[in-house]
Interface confidence: low
């Protein structure tokens, strides 16, 4: 579709049907800005403001932001997956853009130029219970893309999710597509974790999450990150794509249960 | 100290109209929801809607939707409750509560209530 | 009729330990969505108790705990004291787009 044409590279998701929107609370009430959940989540939520700390894992940095590690950061890659980046001005960023990649992509906003996007931006945002955790921009699973359109109605502004189906770039995901069925996309993802963690010689890969996978590469149900120290990482529920089914995680207050949800 | 301070008793008749406020103070009444719960005598809470002070957005519970209006005042940190077609079994007390999203959407701070009374 | 279910009433003596059920299906609660609990003592407003399935708001005495299982959400009083006896409401979201209360459970102190 026409609006698609500004966005650059499109992770493609499974479509947001009406099964999927009922699990989604309404977005919260007050927000200067609404965002996608993360990937391919369908729900939306509030994106942070410029200051505010952000990370891989975090809700998505607002309009004209990015989540940038301290110029000083030691291992940009392992701050922005302990969440300690700032939402910067976008500016300010591309002056470090060559310091930071080719690091996972950092937060930034779905209006970026293809430049950007293509630069190392990828939406990670997250929504009350509903913590998206595994990035999917790794496995290109769908022929929809999901884009926000904010309403202009001044007195009410409606926010609705948009499916369109994809009509460029799908050259880009054929062989991706190919190597989904001989791999899976859990391994998928687990091998380019490592590749970028060999690219930046990371030694000490603490912090940095590497997906559950079956035998035969696609997730497990249960999904956890690494523990630090003392303090359990937690764990949330996903389908053998490693879309989150709704709502269970744990900070490590208590054990999650996945053997009860379906897989899809 | 943050507070809700809510308007008074209201009597009214059947197919009446009835119109609560709700005074926000000690904080930022544009950074949180207003929320409108009611109890009829004796009985247990039920959730009515809610209204974003920051963009006016509602959301209302299906059971009232049409009789429903929820607004904003920002200019005065008022959120008005208008329930509309009045019955018997609209006689309650009507709270209205900040809703707090970064808590999962608990509502942390309470009005006092308005006490209305639906009788012919 | 409420969406989430809480036992009418308990009771305990000063000093006892009750538990208060919350339970909900799997559009609710089993869903996943948080659990916040209200104490509404007599002819006041209700006041947040727990929100987020097992947290405290400041103020609130660390003999109240909340937790959450599966579609079952109890809240846990400790040490119970004279003060306590009010009605006690769940709270959750539901998928068909609306915040849920359980029916309220009134605790009496024996």
């Known amino acids: 579709g026409a609006s698609s044409a500004g966005l650059g590279p499109v992770v493609r998701c499974e479509p947001c049907d009406a099964r999927a929107l009922a699990q989604c609370a309404p977005p919260p009430a007050v927000c200067a800005e609404l965002v996608r959940e993360p990937g391919c989540g369908c729900c939306l939520t509030c994106a942070l403001s410029e200051g505010q700390p952000c990370g891989i894992y975090t809700e998505r940095c607002g309009s004209g932001l990015r989540c940038q590690p301290s110029p000083d950061e030691a291992r940009p890659l392992q701050a922005l997956l302990d969440g300690r980046g700032l939402c910067v001005n976008a500016s300010a960023v591309s002056r470090l853009r060559a310091y930071l990649l080719p690091a996972p992509p950092a937060p930034g906003n779905a209006s970026e130029s293809e430049e950007d996007r293509s630069a190392g931006s990828v939406e990670s945002p997250s929504v009350s219970s509903t913590h998206r955790v595994s990035d999917p921009k790794f496995h290109p699973l769908h022929s929809k893309i999901i884009i926000i359109k904010k309403g202009h109605a001044k007195d009410s502004q409606r926010y609705k999710v948009d499916y369109e189906s994809q009509s460029t770039d799908t050259q880009n995901f054929s062989s991706e597509s190919k190597r989904e069925t001989e791999y899976g996309p859990c391994r998928r993802e687990m091998e380019d974790t490592l590749n970028h963690l060999k690219f930046l010689n990371v030694l000490s890969p603490r912090g940095v999450h590497i997906p559950n996978c079956d035998k035969k590469g696609f997730y497990k149900k249960k999904q956890c990150r690494p523990s630090k120290g003392r303090k359990r990482g937690f764990c949330w529920c996903v389908d053998k794509y490693g879309q989150p089914l709704p709502g269970y995680t744990t900070k490590g207050k208590e054990d999650v249960h996945c053997y009860s949800m379906q897989s899809k | 100290q943050v507070q809700l301070v809510q308007s008074g008793a209201e009597v009214k008749k059947p197919g009446a109209s009835v119109k609560v406020s709700c005074k926000a103070s000690?904080?930022?009444?544009?950074?949180?929801?207003i929320s409108w719960v009611r109890q009829a005598p004796g009985q247990g809470l039920e959730w009515m809607g809610w209204?974003?002070?920051?963009?006016?957005?509602?959301n209302y519970a299906q059971k009232l939707q049409g009789r429903v209006t929820m607004t904003t005042d920002t200019s005065t940190s008022t959120a008005y409750m208008e329930l509309r077609s009045l019955r018997s079994d609209d006689t309650a007390v009507y709270y209205c509560?900040?809703?707090?999203?970064?808590?999962?959407?608990?509502?942390?701070?309470w009005g006092q209530g308005t006490m209305v009374t639906v009788s012919s | 009729q409420a969406v989430l279910t809480q036992p009418p009433s308990v009771s305990g003596a000063p000093g006892q330990r009750v538990t208060i059920s919350c339970t909900g299906s799997?559009?609710?609660?089993?869903?996943?969505?948080?659990v916040h609990w209200y104490q509404q003592l007599p002819g006041t407003a209700p006041k947040l108790l727990i929100y987020?399935?097992?947290n405290r708001p400041s103020g609130v005495p660390d003999r109240f705990s909340g937790s959450k299982s599966g579609t079952s959400a109890p809240l846990a009083i400790t040490g119970l004291q004279a003060e306590d006896e009010a009605d006690y409401y769940c709270?959750?979201?539901?998928?068909?787009?609306?915040?849920?209360f359980g029916g309220g459970t009134k605790l009496t102190v024996l």
């Open positions: 509560a900040r809703v707090k999203w970064e808590l999962g959407w608990a509502f942390d701070i």
């Open positions: 000690g904080y930022t009444f544009t950074s949180y929801g």
């Open positions: 209204i974003s002070a920051y963009n006016g957005n509602t």
């Open positions: 799997s559009s609710n609660i089993g869903a996943g969505y948080d």
């Open positions: 987020g399935n097992s």
């Open positions: 709270q959750s979201y539901d998928s068909s787009l609306s915040t849920v």
